[in-house]
Amino acid sequence: EVEKTACPSGKKAREIDESLIFYKKWELEACVDAALLATQMDRVNAIPFTYEQLDVLKHKLDELYPQGYPESVIQHLGYLFLKMSPEDIRKWNVTSLETLKALLEVNKGHEMSPQVATLIDRFVKGRGQLDKDTLDTLTAFYPGYLCSLSPEELSSVPPSSIWAVRPQDLDTCDPRQLDVLYPKARLAFQNMNGSEYFVKIQSFLGGAPTEDLKALSQQNVSMDLATFMKLRTDAVLPLTVAEVQKLLGPHVEGLKAEERHRPVRDWILRQRQDDLDTLGLGLQGGIPNGYLVLDLSMQEALS
């Protein structure tokens, strides 16, 4: 169809309403005033515009706000947000958590898109740090959000925000990320009593050092095998058989099923076989009785 510029008589939009879904692209372009659209953005989301029509509406807003949309418009973008490019979003200054929530809602149920990643980046940078409310919001929409951050980015998370983190939020974190998060969690939960503390700290233990694991072993925590298997190998190796037995409690029997997997495999290789035998699990591969164990790392440190 030939491009037309003048709005046909009687078709000028007086308000943004459902009648516009019947307009062809050129009619929308000619008959919808950009300023009217900007003031009635909250209506757009309730109207089943086609993707083609949304393109026209976006174009109108782009012309009205070449330097980037104001937050009053951004908050009501609704499905129009899906039409935005990361370049568009970099022009925005989003400061309201309500605006962030509104836009994340549009993308709910989908993978984190480049648009969403850019939006979050702009929002967090604008705030200066990843505060508790923001983290709460982000992990609610994207449970894997924390684990998508670099250790450097995670360092800006204040300990107070750790209260918002759920176990599933850490499922995809690697040891480098847990190394950063664990000290923050330890600080955040420090005033809790033993059993409550363990429940909260459990999902962060992949970043715990040996001395903290030793301390936990004195508190009858009964760590499950899944948590144990996620511990840092270098933190597990120095633990004695007695400490591991206390740490796992009744779950110690699960070591047999995991004896070929790290960190259990590597830990077994470091234990005396007769110590392992005391567990009565039939664990094999420990240091034979009568052998002398030299700690080469200690020797190197002394020389």
Epitope: G10, E18, I21, F22, E27, A46, T50, E52, Q53
Partner: antibody, heavy 128, light 106 residues
Framework: QVQLVQSGAEVKKPGASVKVSCKAS????????IHWVRQAPGQCLEWMGW????????HYAQKFQGRVTMTRDTSISTAYMELSRLRSDDTAVYYC?????????????????????WGQGTTVTVSS | SYELTQPASVSVSPGQTASITCSGD??????ASWYQQKPGQSPVLVIY???KRPSGIPERFSGSNSGNTATLTISGTQAMDEADYYC?????????FGCGTKLTVL
């Protein structure tokens, strides 16, 4: 079967209002738009506007803006058309008709299919 | 506002072909529908989307639409086809009717 059943005839004085109902049955009420069309004695069909029963969205012909109000009650699958400030030239048979909105071939915009089911009509007489 | 123009009346002998036209600016760019209305009855859709026939409408009814004119053609016209015929087009969100053509079967 699919049908639209309208309320009975009305006699009104000039300046009064009339409210005509249109009850749908035999199909999903929220799946089709309801249009209102009137026909004065011996005259042409005149379109008044539509309502989307699903959203409640409306669009009225310019001629009736400010005088007509279209509403619906989805719980009883009924659409209503109220015309206020009646004049003698509003004397007519008022019809409701359903029409489906479909996406155009290239999915650029929506358009209406034909009005495939009509009510039996409601005669409104405006006389002093 | 958009207008559709129809001839006031068309006459045809039984068995012959009747053509009723409907003209409007760039009507071919819009979808046209046709309705049949007999005295004292509600209109009935006979053609929609230019040339499609609803179920129950005889094959003798056909339609076309191009340029500025839509045409309803009734081939092998029968006495029962005598009625008023209205063309109708969707102009974006707005509906426009022609003023009807009275088809007389001689």
């Amino acid at each position: 079967q699919v049908q639209l059943v309208q309320s009975g005839a009305e006699v009104k004085k000039p300046g009064a209002s009339v409210k005509v109902s249109c009850k749908a049955s035999g199909y999903t009420f929220t799946g089709y738009y309801i249009h209102w069309v009137r026909q004065a004695p011996g005259q042409c069909l005149e379109w008044m506007g539509w309502i989307n029963p699903k959203s409640g969205g409306t669009h009225y012909a310019q001629k009736f803006q400010g005088r007509v109000t279209m509403t619906r009650d989805t719980s009883i699958s009924t659409a209503y058309m109220e015309l206020s400030r009646l004049r003698s030239d509003d004397t007519a048979v008022y019809y409701c008709a359903r029409a489906e909105a479909r996406l155009a071939a290239r999915q650029e915009y929506y358009y209406f299919y034909g009005m495939d089911v009509w009510g039996q009509g409601t005669t409104v007489t405006v006389s002093s | 506002s958009y207008e559709l123009t129809q001839p006031a009346s068309v006459s045809v002998s039984p068995g012959q072909t009747a053509s009723i036209t409907c003209s409007g600016d760039k009507l071919g760019d819009k979808y046209a529908s046709w309705y049949q209305q007999k005295p004292g009855q509600s209109p009935v859709l006979v053609i929609y989307q230019d040339s499609k026939r609803p179920s129950g409408i005889p094959e003798r009814f056909s339609g076309s639409n191009s340029g500025n004119t839509a045409t309803l053609t009734i081939s092998g016209t029968q006495a029962m086809d005598e009625a008023d015929y209205y063309c109708q087009a969707w102009d974006s969100s707005t509906v426009v009717f022609g003023c009807g053509t009275k088809l007389t079967v001689l």
